[in-house]
């Protein structure tokens, strides 16, 4: 019986050209995590294997960095990076748990523009 739950960073936004950390956390289970696959829609970004360590897909090698932890760091973001990301936890004996993150890459940061103006 699968008792675990995946907590994610949920819906997040980041600025074009910047970087973002995608994080998932598996809780409420004693199952052993054997591997975590990170996917963007149907594309594999990276795999973190408990024995073999991190392996980044060749097409993302320049823009994806492993970690922190089982998370994934996306760098040099473009508007095309907007979309759904999935962390797929392979565990024993439970099986597979999947978490979803929606990333929106913005042309510019509203927060940064706002910080330029000070109210006297």
């Amino acid at each position: 019986m699968m008792t675990g739950t995946i907590e994610t960073t949920g819906n997040i936004s980041a600025e074009k050209g910047g970087s973002i950390i995608l994080q998932c956390h598996l809780s409420s289970t004693t199952a052993q995590v054997t591997q975590v696959n990170w996917e963007q829609q149907d594309q594999l970004l990276a795999i973190c294997n408990a024995d073999l360590g991190w392996h980044i897909s060749p097409s993302f090698k320049d823009r994806v960095a492993p970690g922190p932890g089982l998370g994934l760091t996306l760098q040099s973001l473009t508007v095309n990076d907007t979309g759904e990301y999935f962390c797929i936890y392979h565990t024993y004996p439970d099986g597979t748990y999947t978490g979803r993150i929606f990333l929106e890459v913005l042309e510019s940061s509203v927060a940064e523009h706002g910080a330029r103006f000070q109210i006297p």
């Epitope: 795999i47 073999l52 024993y92």
Partner: nanobody, 117 residues
């Protein structure tokens, strides 16, 4: 399922060389990386080296860097471990492992490497 068969182990003098091979068969399309591990008597299994199947990205344990080289022949679905400047502490059973997209590693039966002083 993925089957792994190791070969090339044996007895070698300290300072000598050996080349281990690991042939994969079965559902090899499911493999994204392969690696070598070793287990010495009375010790836990430890990582030695790995190589990604999609490119030539390699990783090594600090204890073997500069002495061991992992390589792959994708056409033959075979991974190799060239071991040079062998030391007594390299004595162990060496296991091949295949990391699979489906989440579970496949393991070989192991090949014994003994380095005599």
């Amino acid at each position: 399922e993925v089957q792994l068969v190791e070969s090339g182990g044996g007895l070698v003098q300290a300072g000598g060389s050996l080349r281990l091979s690991c042939a994969a068969s079965g559902s090899t399309f499911d493999i994204y990386a392969m690696g070598w591990f070793r287990q010495a008597p009375g010790k836990e299994r430890e990582f030695v080296a790995s190589i990604s199947s999609g490119d030539t990205n390699t990783n090594y344990a600090d204890s073997v860097k500069g002495r061991f080289t992992i390589s792959a022949d994708n056409a033959k679905n075979t991974v190799y471990l060239q071991m040079n400047s062998l030391k007594h502490e390299d004595t162990a059973v060496y296991y091949c492992a295949a990391g699979r997209y489906s989440g579970y590693n496949s393991w070989g039966q192991g090949t014994q490497v003994t380095v005599s002083s």
